[in-house]
Amino acid sequence: FKVATLYSLYVCPEGQNVTLTCRVFGPVDKGHDVTFYKTWYRSSRGEVQTCSERRPIRNLTFQDLHLHHGGHQAANTSHDLAQRHGLESASDHHGNFSITMRNLTLLDSGLYCCLVVEIRHHHSEHRVHGAMELQVQTGKDAPSSCVAYPSSSQESENITAA
C-alpha cells in the first residue's frame, strides 16, 4: 500500500479549524493477522529524510494520537486527552486518515506528518508516511477561510473543517 497526501500546503487564518488528510491506497490486507497503526506528528524537513523526527502536536505525542485497527475499518481518537487539546484523528472505510485541529493559532504552523504502519504476525513492519505544511496567518493578508493547495499542480481549494 501507499500513502497519498491530497494537499501539500494548507493556509489558514488564526482561529479557524482545519482537517489535514492522508489517503491509504493500494492493496490493503484485511486478514486476521494484520493490524494497522496510524498516527500524526509534527516534524521538520530534514536534509536526508522528511518526517524522521517525531514532535508533539499541541503537547500530544504520536502515541497519544494513534489509531489502531484492522484493514479499512473506521476509527477515531475519542479520548478526552486529544479533544481537550482541540484535536481529533479519524480514519474511514475508504482509506482516508485525518487529523482535525480546532481554533488554530500561529504556533500550529509547521510540517505535519501522517504515518501508517502495517503490522503483521512474524513480518517486519511496512511503514509509509506523508507530509504536508500548515501555515497559519493573521492580519490583512490572511485568507478568510482555509485554502488547500493540491500536491500536484491543480487549482487551490477552499476547505474549512466543521
Epitope: 493477522d33 497503526y37 504476525h121 513480518h123 517486519s124
Partner: antibody, heavy 119, light 107 residues
Framework: QLQLQESGPGLVKPSETLSLTCTVS??????????WGWIRQPPGKGLEWIGS???????YYNPSLKSRVTISVDTSKNQCSLKLNSVTTADTAVYYC???????????WGQGTLVTVSS | DIQMTQSPSSLSASVGDRVTITCRAS??????LAWYQQKPEKAPKSLIY???SLQSGVPSRFSGSGSGTDFTLTISSLQPEDFATYYC?????????FGQGTKLEIK
C-alpha cells in the same frame, strides 16, 4: 514514569529452560502501539535482540533463537515473559526487557538480570 | 540478517574533544537507526532515533547523521559523564541488530 523490572532465577542448568518475567509499572502492557522485547548481553560482549511481542499478541523472534524462544504476555499481571529452552553456557548473559513504540527503537529498558548457565 | 559494523571498536579521548563514531549497515536501512549509550552495570540508554533525531532529555552535544548504509554519532564536546560504550541499532527490519559497540575511554 514507566518502569520495567526483570525477575527470575539467576542460575539455570544446561539443557533446562530459562524463564524470566518482566513486570511493568507506571503503564499498561496492553496499551496499543507498543512492542515488548527482550535483549541479552553476554558478559563483556555486545547486545543481541531475542524477540518482541506486539500489544495485539503478534510475536517476532530472532531466527538464531526462534526454535527455542517463546515470549508471552499476562495482561492481568501486567507482565511479559521469556522462555528459552535447552540452554547452554553460551546463553549466559544479562537479559533485558525493553519497550519500543511502533516504528521506533527501544526507548524504555529494565535494569537487566544476570542469568548464568552452569551445572 | 542486516549486519551492523561500528568503528572504531575503542577510542581514547579527553574532556572537551569532539568525537565521531561510525556505523555501517550491510544493506540500506533508510533512516531507521538508533544510537545507545551504556555505562558499566547499567542498561543501554537511547540517545538518537531515526538516525538524527535526539531522544527527549538527551544533551544537544550529541548528534547523529546519515542515511542508507552509513551513519555517524558525534559528541561535540566530551563531558566526563560521556565515557561509556556506544551501540548503533537498526530497526528497519527483523531481526533487529546491533553494532558490536564502541568503547569510549578517557585518554
Amino acid at each position: 514514569q514507566l518502569q520495567l523490572q526483570e525477575s527470575g532465577p539467576g542460575l539455570v542448568k544446561p539443557s533446562e529452560t530459562l524463564s524470566l518475567t518482566c513486570t511493568v509499572s507506571g503503564g499498561s502492557i496492553s496499551s496499543s502501539g507498543y512492542y515488548w522485547g527482550w535483549i541479552r548481553q553476554p558478559p563483556g560482549k555486545g547486545l543481541e535482540w531475542i524477540g518482541s511481542l506486539y500489544s495485539s499478541g503478534y510475536t517476532y523472534y530472532n531466527p538464531s533463537l526462534k526454535s527455542r524462544v517463546t515470549i508471552s504476555v499476562d495482561t492481568s499481571k501486567n507482565q511479559c515473559s521469556l522462555k528459552l529452552n535447552s540452554v547452554t553456557t553460551a546463553d549466559t548473559a544479562v537479559y533485558y526487557c525493553a519497550r519500543h513504540p511502533v516504528a521506533m527503537n527501544f526507548d524504555d529498558w529494565g535494569q537487566g538480570t544476570l542469568v548464568t548457565v552452569s551445572s | 540478517d542486516i549486519q551492523m559494523t561500528q568503528s572504531p571498536s575503542s577510542l581514547s579521548a579527553s574532556v572537551g574533544d569532539r568525537v565521531t563514531i561510525t556505523c555501517r549497515a550491510s544493506q540500506g536501512i533508510s533512516s531507521w537507526l538508533a544510537w545507545y549509550q551504556q555505562k558499566p552495570e547499567k542498561a543501554p540508554k537511547s540517545l538518537i532515533y531515526a538516525a538524527s533525531s535526539l531522544q527527549s532529555g538527551v544533551p544537544s552535544r550529541f548528534s547523529g547523521s546519515g542515511s542508507g548504509t552509513d551513519f555517524t554519532l558525534t559528541i561535540s564536546s566530551l563531558q566526563p559523564e560521556d565515557f561509556a560504550t556506544y551501540y548503533c541499532q537498526q530497526y528497519n527490519s527483523y531481526p533487529y541488530t546491533f553494532g558490536q559497540g564502541t568503547k569510549l575511554e578517557i585518554k
